[in-house]
């Protein structure tokens, strides 16, 4: 019961996380214009992974896509790639985990198969979450670097004719959505991996019982067989117990003419 709950909860948490990663990737507010000490108030700019938007003082908002690929920073391309990989892995993980759910019966699927699928989806969710967290963190680092560079340039005056950005950008809502979503996906993946351990059919643990017959020594073979000299009653190495170890009374040895050599 606990295993089913852990698996189900892991699935739901991962589902929410992946939905969040998709939402963050599509959002336009990855970076927002820092309004502090900015003399230009007629426009407010916010930017996403795919396009830039401007909200004018008139209330008019316009967005334009980054139509060039070569002109964009490599870091932005890396963030896009990380987010897309995260989404793809998460989506595959969700698909796999649906079939792995203990509460869903598909044909005569064995528990071992479900356990493997649960582990696979768990690992996929973990990698997906890490991709999202990494992508958002790389972007945040890029913003911080750009912010301080812009701040430095603001106070250098008009020395160089082509200055870098005077508009500074700060963290947008999408970054926080991405961090939380990545974390949820990661947690969901860990829960799936934990659930996998409970789903796996365990090997039957036999009680370690020492067997000894009266009058001669008998070895106990760990495989569940009684080793004999080959002349006794167990010449074919047949399993002498099933479903657990038997007591000494049940496994009785009778003396034979070969007992004493």
């Amino acid at each position: 019961m606990a295993v089913t709950a852990c698996q189900g909860l892991g699935f739901v948490v991962s589902l929410i996380g992946i939905a969040g990663i998709i939402a963050a990737t599509c959002m336009d507010q990855w970076s927002t214009q820092d309004l502090y000490n900015n003399p230009v108030t007629a426009v407010f700019n916010y930017q996403g992974l795919w396009r830039s938007c401007v909200r004018e003082s008139s209330g008019f908002t316009e967005c334009r896509g980054y139509f060039t690929l070569l002109g964009l920073p490599a870091m932005l391309q890396a963030v896009r790639a990380l987010m897309i990989v995260g989404i793809v892995l998460g989506a595959i993980g969700l698909l796999v985990s649906i079939f792995a759910l203990k509460c869903i019966r598909i044909g005569s699927m064995e528990d071992s198969a479900k356990a493997n699928m649960t582990l696979t989806s768990g690992i996929m969710f973990i990698v997906s979450g890490l991709c999202a967290i990494a992508g958002v963190s790389v972007f945040a680092n890029m913003l911080v670097t750009n912010f301080w560079m812009s701040t430095a340039n603001m106070y250098t005056g008009m020395g160089g004719m082509v200055q870098t950005v005077q508009t500074r950008y700060t963290f947008g809502a999408a970054l926080f959505v991405g961090w939380v979503a990545g974390g949820l996906t990661l947690i969901g993946g860990v829960m799936m991996c934990i659930a996998c351990r409970g789903l796996a059919p365990e090997e039957t643990n036999y009680k370690a019982v020492s067997y000894h017959a009266s009058g001669h020594s008998v070895a106990y073979k760990p495989g569940g067989f009684k080793a004999s000299t080959g002349f006794g009653s167990n010449t074919k190495n047949k399993k002498i117990y099933d479903g657990g170890a038997r007591t000494e009374d049940e496994v009785q040895s009778y003396p034979s003419k070969h007992d004493y050599v």
């Epitope: 007629a42 426009v43 700019n45 830039s52 401007v54 008139s58 334009r64 980054y66 005077q166 508009t167």
Partner: nanobody, 118 residues
Framework: EVQLVESGGGLVQPGGSLRLSCAAS????????MGWWRQAPGSQRELVAI???????QYGDSVKGRFTISRDNAKNTVYLQMANLKPEDTAVYYC????????????WGQGTQVTVSL
């Protein structure tokens, strides 16, 4: 690369008028503003006026009511009509294009000198 060419600066008497123009050449990202900033000797850069790609206009506090900015999107040109000039308007006027592509980009002209004096 975007190139900005300014013209129209010069010496003018107080109360006089001047018209500055700035033409941008090259590929400019669609979301942007074009405008004018000025810097007097020993002073910080100051916003004069900007005109956005969406049609919004903003003026610096010290020039409101006296200066008029206009923009020709087809020619990628911005104009600054300065009237009722005062000696304190004396400065180097810089044309600026700020594009809102990824993390923004600034382009500046070489600057044109405006001197208001008797």
């Amino acid at each position: 690369e975007v190139q900005l060419v300014e013209s129209g600066g010069g010496l003018v008497q107080p109360g006089g008028s001047l018209r500055l123009s700035c033409a941008a050449s090259g590929s400019i990202f669609g979301l942007n503003f074009m405008g004018w900033w000025r810097q007097a000797p020993g002073s910080q850069r100051e916003l004069v006026a900007i005109a956005t790609s969406g049609g919004s206009i903003q003026y610096g506090d010290s020039v409101k009511g006296r200066f008029t900015i206009s923009r020709d999107n087809a020619k990628n040109t911005v104009y600054l009509q300065m009237a009722n000039l005062k000696p304190e308007d004396t400065a180097v006027y810089y044309c600026n294009v700020h594009t809102y592509d990824f993390l923004g980009r600034d382009y500046w002209g070489q600057g044109t000198q405006v001197t208001v004096s008797l």
